[in-house]
């Protein structure tokens, strides 16, 4: 009796694990084994697929094969007993394209009202994601064990801290990875649960703000109790993305170590151009608070978020406003390479009734204006990142008269 070729071959790739599954064509025939060959693009010869020869089950693992994951390969399978079936060819595929991101590893630390989540790729030193290690982002779902109401948090990196939790409460979460550059979404990790601790005697400092005065940064915060000492630490924000290393080398700001006031002043040259995280801790000599919420601090934005510059093209019933980069001394434009939102305020020159438009685009239409009427416009920029939460001052008002009727085209 002729052996039939196996059918329905599935290739599952998760991280660096390559698994093949298939269906037996004839369940009635016993003691059948299966073997695979593979062929690389541009090659004529077929090579035996190690790990997938003379297999008695309908599953095999060929992870040990060192493939170029970006190179297309073709597989074929046949059944063997005394004789062999014809080969069944599997559609060719590129491992990287087919690969799924496996569940990440999750490590949790508990405080009284916060949980620190450290996330690592599920496969250490993965070949599949070797070029994408720093591109992983993660999303998580968290819920109180007692309620089950889920909250989703998107676009986090390998270290994330969730605040404003309840003490002595068990929280559960699961995490998945994504490679947005390759449109890949991974599978969720197992569920991890952790209980927050009893409430700490000392609360962490709150409402941390940075401002600029002369050549100094002024860091201010609020605290519940008097007669405390505080310390401030900083970390390069990009270090939160480091997938393999969970040793975060927070650094002391020398002028903000053991300060007895709820502010500290330090020279701007302490920080080179960049984005940093800042955190503050309180101590009464015996006890210490947990660290405050970490605030993001961008030296560029902090130093100078300039008001936008804009031109107005007047029509009969609208203004078209074109927003450009602000100018610095010498009339050179300032390159602000972070996303901004523009707030545009406009009013009829003879009235105090202001109207507001919020836009992400740099070309904005102000609609519903009256012809031959003078309107004034001013604008300011806001950073789009709610953690930075910076705004420029308003630009000077520019007043223009709308055109006569029927010129809206």
């Amino acid at each position: 009796k002729n052996l039939k070729s196996p059918q329905k071959v599935e290739v599952d790739i998760i991280d660096d694990n390559f698994i093949l599954r298939w269906n037996r064509s004839d369940e009635s025939v016993g003691n059948v084994t299966f073997s695979f060959d593979y062929q690389k693009t541009g090659m004529d010869n077929w090579i035996k697929l190690s790990g997938c020869q003379n297999i008695t089950s309908t599953k095999c693992n060929f992870s040990s094969l060192k493939l170029n994951v970006y190179e297309e390969i073709k597989l074929r399978i046949r059944a063997e007993k005394e004789n062999t079936s014809s080969w069944y060819e599997v559609d060719s595929f590129t491992p990287f394209r087919k690969a799924q991101i496996g569940p990440p590893e999750v490590h949790l630390e508990a405080e009284d009202k916060a949980i620190v989540i450290h996330i690592s790729p599920g496969t250490k030193d993965s070949v599949m994601w070797a070029l994408d290690g720093l591109s992983f982002t993660y999303s998580l779902v968290i819920w109180k064990n007692s309620s089950g109401v889920e909250e989703r948090i998107e676009n986090i990196y390998s270290r994330h801290k969730i605040y404003k939790l309840s003490p002595e409460t068990t929280y559960c979460l699961k995490v998945k990875a994504a490679l947005l550059t390759s449109w890949k979404i991974g599978v969720y990790s197992p569920v991890h649960c952790i209980k927050t601790t009893v409430e700490n005697e000392l609360p962490p400092p709150e409402n941390i703000e940075v401002s600029v005065q002369n050549q100094n940064y002024v860091l201010k915060w609020d605290y519940t109790y008097a007669n405390m000492t505080f310390q401030v630490q900083w970390l390069h924000a990009f270090l939160k993305r480091n997938p393999g290393n969970h040793l975060y080398k927070w650094k002391q700001i020398p002028d903000c170590e053991n300060v007895k006031t709820t502010q500290c002043v330090f020279p701007q040259n302490v920080f080179q151009k960049g984005i940093y995280l800042l955190r503050v801790q309180a101590s009464d000599g015996n006890n210490t608070s947990f660290w405050s919420e970490e605030i993001k601090f961008d030296t560029e934005i902090q130093a100078f978020l300039l008001p936008p510059v804009f031109n107005i093209r007047s029509l009969s019933d609208s203004f078209h406003i074109y927003i450009g980069a602000p100018k610095q001394s010498g009339n050179t434009p300032v390159i602000q390479d972070y996303p901004l939102i523009y707030e545009i305020i406009f009013w009829e020159n003879t009235s105090n009734a202001e109207r507001k438009i919020i836009e992400k685009k740099t070309d904005v239409t102000v609609p519903n204006l009256k012809p031959l009427t003078v309107y004034c416009v001013k604008a300011r920029a806001h950073t789009m990142d709610e953690k930075l939460n910076k705004s420029s001052v308003f630009s000077d008002a520019v007043c223009e008269k709308t055109k006569p009727g029927n010129t809206s085209k």
Epitope: E109, A110, E111, T197, V198, N200, N245, L247, F290
Partner: antibody, heavy 118, light 107 residues
Framework: EVQLQQFGAELVKPGASVKLSCTAS????????MHWVKQRTEQGLEWIGR????????KYAPKFQVKATITADTSSNTAYLHFSSLTSEDTAVYYC???????????WGQGTTLTVSS | DIVMTQSQKFMSTSVGDRVSVTCKAS??????VAWYQQKPGQSPKALIY???YRYSGVPDRFTGSGSGTDFTLTISNVQSEDLAEYFC?????????FGGGTKLEIK
């Protein structure tokens, strides 16, 4: 394989100074913290301090602030503990330890036995 | 400084038993606690970090638990090779501090 190589023993006179070394292999000390821990016979463990070899930043336990100086040489992948004005109280085993992920002490050297005696 | 107290200096147990070594912190340290094992004549070896995470290669009979101020290292099915001293340590605030140690004796 991660290893922290320390010399077995040092014998020094009271009032003198000593510099203990710890040479790491299997990892780059710049990527970690390097700590020093003291253990006297039949006693517990005392944290002396640590260094960030990447930039030389140090932290010390108040008790050792004056007596101890921790340094590192990244070119030889070595951390050092300099102990000054030695007394019999400084007789102990000194361990160098790697501060790894989440700040924990994941690898310990075999220790150097320092004996201060005239 | 945070004081880590291991109230039992010695504990006696038999092979196959389950034993719990406790450690109390003088203030809330979250889950920032590690446990180390030191066998006679050897340097300490890391067992547990972040209160409950086992280092790779550490037998699963060693389990860490606790948060806030109270922490426990449990050894189930004690083996003769577990004869050692066990230290807890807080890693949340400088100076890092250790407990005084608990010596496990095998009957």
């Amino acid at each position: 394989e991660v290893q922290l190589q320390q010399f077995g023993a040092e014998l020094v006179k009271p009032g003198a100074s000593v510099k203990l070394s710890c040479t790491a292999s299997g990892f780059n000390i710049k990527d970690y913290y390097m700590h020093w821990v003291k253990q006297r016979t039949e006693q517990g463990l005392e944290w002396i301090g640590r260094i960030d070899p990447e930039d030389g930043e140090t932290k010390y336990a108040p008790k050792f602030q004056v007596k101890a100086t921790i340094t590192a040489d990244t070119s030889s992948n070595t951390a050092y503990l300099h102990f000054s004005s030695l007394t019999s109280e400084d007789t102990a085993v000194y361990y160098c330890v790697r501060g790894g992920n989440f700040y924990y002490f994941d690898y310990w050297g075999q220790g150097t036995t320092l004996t201060v005696s005239s | 400084d945070i004081v880590m107290t291991q109230s039992q200096k010695f504990m006696s147990t038999s092979v196959g038993d389950r034993v719990s070594v406790t450690c109390k912190a003088s203030q809330n340290v979250g889950t920032n606690v590690a446990w180390y094992q030191q066998k006679p004549g050897q340097s300490p070896k890391a067992l547990i970090y972040s209160a409950s995470y086992r280092y790779s290669g550490v037998p699963d009979r060693f389990t860490g638990s606790g948060s806030g101020t109270d922490f426990t290292l449990t050894i189930s099915n004690v083996q003769s090779e577990d004869l050692a001293e066990y230290f807890c340590q807080q890693c949340i605030n400088y100076p890092y501090t250790f407990g005084g140690g608990t010596k496990l004796e095998i009957k």
